[in-house]
């Protein structure tokens, strides 16, 4: 019969022969022959392969370097890589999470719209009219201005996006 030019799924073509790929978690030791199946070996400790493959070397698990603010979120297996995340108060600089940076704080006049996670930074928003933030914070939302009326007081100084209103007693001398 004619040697194949293409192979089935989970097979590969080598020297005019279709051989089975190695399953995830195993590496290729030797190609198949007409008489012998593909030789595969399990990946070693701290190694993985996550696809059907013909790799002769397994990949090393990612190292979550504490010096870069990283910690293990999910331990790797022979079929999956280690997933790193950042220590509390830090977030990944990229999708691959190879290093961490400190969460951004929202400046006065801005409040936290979304608190940072291990993989995303703080999202800030400007305080709208009627709200303020007078601190630099990674957690504080914009606070509503104090309602002087509910305290039976009057506004003595208007609020801004950075300051609260100042309430004072009502003027008793009314015509």
């Amino acid at each position: 019969p004619e040697p194949p030019t293409a192979c089935r799924e989970k097979q590969y073509l080598i020297n005019s022969q279709c051989c089975s790929l190695c399953q995830p978690g195993q590496k290729l030791v030797s190609d198949c022959t007409e008489f012998t199946e593909t030789e595969c070996l399990p990946c070693g400790e701290s190694e993985f392969l996550d696809t059907w493959n013909r790799e002769t070397h397994c990949h090393q698990h990612k190292y979550c370097d504490p010096n870069l603010g990283l910690r293990v979120q999910q331990k790797g297996t022979s079929e999956t890589d280690t997933i790193c995340t950042c220590e509390e108060g830090w977030h990944c600089t990229s999708e691959a999470c190879e290093s961490c940076v400190l969460h951004r704080s929202c400046s006065p006049g801005f409040g936290v719209k979304q608190i940072a996670t291990g993989v995303s930074d703080t999202i800030c928003e400007p305080c709208p009219v009627g709200f303020f933030s007078n601190v630099s914070s990674a957690f504080e939302k914009c606070h509503p201005w104090t309602s002087c009326e509910t305290k039976d007081l009057v506004v003595q100084q208007a609020g801004t996006n950075k300051t609260d209103v100042v309430c004072g007693p009502q003027d008793r001398l009314r015509a």
Epitope: N15, S30, D31, C32, T33, E34, F35, T36, E37, E39
Partner: antibody, heavy 117, light 109 residues
Amino acid sequence: QVQLVESGGGVVQPGRSLRLSCAASGFTFEKYGMHWVRQAPGKGLEWVAVISYEGTKKYYADSVKGRFTISRDNSKNTLYLQMNSLRAEDTAVYYCARDTSRGHDIWGQGTMVTVSS
Amino acid sequence: EIVLTQSPGTLSLSPGERATLSCRASQSVSYSYLAWYQQKPGQAPRLLIYGASSLATGIPDRFSGSGSGTDFTLTISRLEPEDFAVYYCQQYSDYPPFTFGGGTKVEIK
């Protein structure tokens, strides 16, 4: 460790039969093709037969075709060579060897077959 | 059938010398499916080189293989006392039969 051990050799008269065995250990026998190779006293290596991992494909050297039969029992991790109508020229050390795309990577220590009247 | 011819039949050398063994095929060996084996008296053959040039597991790097098509060479860069033995080439690309060369004996001079 990976090992092949042949047995069943001996002295036999011409025209008689003998069955050689090769016991495998230390590897997944059912995944590998297996060969028999022989070596007459003071001579070189001669390939005899091969069988595929599941036993469906078998090839023989012309010198033994129709007289020798290669077989295997994967449940017993054992390879066999049934030798019928033996001749003086079949006198040799018989080795079993493991098939890979790297050649015959593991060999047994051999078993001696002497065909003599 | 691919016929393999090895030369020389015998090579007389001293320890420390370089050994060059030749294996010539009667027709091209596809995919360089050619192996070299070492055999010492009373022992089974041992795989040294596969795919014409790849070193088998556990074999010292003083052994090397080269060649393609019909001409192949096994080189031992510096002979050690334990290297004196018979060496066989074998093709496993075109079968049946899997053929061996007649062997080269490397002996102490």
